[in-house]
């Protein structure tokens, strides 16, 4: 049913979702921080383009009886009792903030008439692309796909002179919701890695991977997984690996590669590090880049909502247009506007556009380097370390099919 | 000696592309952190690209999207793609080091300098 929303008279409020389920296992106070930390530098910046009107934050919690196995699992139905929540209490604000699980996402989507824009920290699946009033400010797996067939079939660098066109996956059903959605993606049979690839496997269990990387008969030398170092290393251990396997870690939201006393232990010299780059600007905003660890990213996309909605809220006043309207709920997309880090760029479908970067390990220095870095907004690699100290053989990554000659 | 050497400038038209150079001798480009620079005339000198010495390229907004740097430790050089030239970007271009305290920032100063390399950006 149609429910009205608090969002005119020069007062404009913004709902924001607190579920028990969450994408990340971040307290729900520092989400509430980092919204409230949004909401501060919005009204400075509506203050200084002479708009004098006020922005709020209702803050919806779930009463967690139910749905309480705080991960995503029991996230759908949760998502659509904020919904119902809301709407008893005639309390919609001009946008939704949260959810950031998949399921809760698709299926509030799929059971509301939105006539509103929905932000979420998340919504990581191919199940949520494409979708006229989301926006959704974290890497989803349309991104991740999009950068590992590029690079799979990049040939034509001084450290890959081959396509590949083989993998293996590792997924065994531990992931965190991101990771399970990006494998999901990959795993997918209808999905544009699987139609591009000729080869590919999901390993299932630590036993299947673990005997791919000595095993003469594998079909593929490069292994695809998602998690930290220490992930890699529970499943890995110090086992001997065949001097061509080539891992790729898939580890988008982790900062730890970018601390300056990082050594890179001795199991990751096979291993190529998929990652965000912690920052693209030259220049330091007025306002600190130093957020605390426990705003990285996740409640960092929150703030960037608030945010993102400021610059939305700002362009629509100035232009005397009407907020509670199809036009405004169809306008978050494919636009830069000024995060708290720096600009942000969503593409044509709402989704946050990002500089992945791609490390290796230096057999010299036994630090993490920058091999390559890829651009969502463009889907272009730009490689960056031409002679890469590699512990491949001539310093080039190997062919994806052992014993395959050159293409 | 420590010493920089550009080259690569020249006379481009709008829309069109080149490719500076940057080589050091007398230390290792891997160590350091480097940076682009350029002098438009009558104008202050503005940081371009930052490459930190872990290799992580950090962009001023106005050439995001169109410069790309890389580096070759190999031949001790580095390079400056710059694409979808402009008028505004004509400018004498300088590239800098400065031995890293951080492998993962742009250093507040550098300390060694090259000469400079002419681009020009016309019709």
């Known amino acids: 049913s149609q429910v009205s929303q608090n969002c005119h008279n020069g007062s404009y409020e913004i709902s924001v979702l607190m579920m028990g389920n969450s994408a990340f296992a971040e307290p729900l106070k520092n989400l509430e921080d980092a919204v409230n930390e949004g909401l501060e530098i919005v009204r400075g910046r509506l203050q200084n383009a002479g708009l004098n009107v006020t922005v709020n934050a209702t803050f919806m919690y779930s009463d967690g009886l139910i749905h309480n196995s705080g991960d995503c699992r029991s996230s759908t139905c949760e998502g659509l009792d904020l919904l119902r929540k809301i709407s008893n209490a005639q309390r919609m604000g001009c946008v939704l903030i949260g959810p950031s699980c998949t399921y809760s996402t698709f299926q509030m989507y799929l059971d509301t008439e939105l006539s509103y824009p929905m932000i979420s920290a998340g919504s990581f699946g191919l199940s949520c692309d494409y979708k006229e009033t989301l926006t959704r400010l974290m890497s989803p797996a349309r991104k991740l796909m999009y950068f590992l067939v590029n690079f799979w079939k990049t040939n034509d660098l001084p450290f890959k002179t081959y396509s590949w066109s083989t993998s293996y996956v590792y997924k065994n059903g531990t992931e965190t919701e991101d990771c399970f959605w990006y494998l999901n993606a990959l795993e997918a049979s209808v999905s544009y890695f699987s139609h591009e690839l000729g080869f590919k496997v999901v390993l299932r269990q630590d036993k299947e991977f673990q005997d791919i990387l000595m095993d003469h008969n594998r079909k593929s030398n490069v292994i695809i997984m998602c998690g930290g170092p220490e992930f890699l290393y529970k499943l890995k251990g110090d086992r001997a690996v065949a001097e061509d396997i080539v891992i790729i870690l898939v580890d988008l939201f982790n900062d730890q590669y970018f601390e300056d006393n990082v050594t890179a232990p001795d199991y990751m010299k096979n291993v190529l590090v998929l990652t965000l780059s912690p920052g693209n600007s030259l220049l330091n905003s007025s306002f600190s880049r130093n957020l605390s660890p426990t705003k990285r990213d996740f409640a960092l996309a929150y703030l960037n909502g608030i945010l993102l909605f400021g610059h939305m809220l700002k362009i629509f006043l100035e232009n005397g247009e009407n907020i509670t309207t199809p036009k405004f709920a169809h306008a978050f997309r494919n636009l830069t506007f000024e995060g708290y880090d720096g600009p942000v760029t969503l593409d044509d479908w709402g989704d946050v556009d990002s500089t992945m970067v791609l490390l290796y390990t230096s057999v010299d220095t036994k630090k993490y380097k920058v091999l390559l870095t890829y651009d969502t907004h463009v889907n272009k690699t730009y490689p960056v370390d031409m002679s890469p100290t590699f512990t491949w053989k001539n310093s080039k990554l190997p062919n994806d099919i052992t014993g395959r000659g050159p293409q | 000696e420590v010493q920089l050497v550009e080259s690569g400038g020249g006379l481009v038209q709008p829309g069109g592309s080149l490719r500076l150079s940057c080589a050091a001798s007398?230390?290792?480009?891997?160590?350091?952190?480097i940076g682009w620079f350029r002098q438009a005339p009558g104008k202050e000198r503005e940081g371009v690209i930052c490459l930190t010495s872990g290799g992580l390229p950090k962009y001023a907004d106005s050439v995001k999207g169109r410069f790309t740097i890389s580096r070759d430790n190999a031949k001790n050089t580095l390079y400056l793609q710059m694409n979808s030239l402009r008028a505004e970007d004509t400018a004498v271009y300088y590239c800098?080091?400065?031995?890293?305290?951080?492998?993962?920032?742009?250093?507040?100063?550098?300390?060694?300098w090259g000469q400079g390399t002419m681009v020009t950006v016309s019709s």
């Open positions: 800098a080091a400065s031995g890293a305290t951080s492998r993962w920032n742009c250093p507040p100063q550098y300390d060694h």
């Open positions: 007398g230390f290792t480009l891997d160590d350091y952190a």
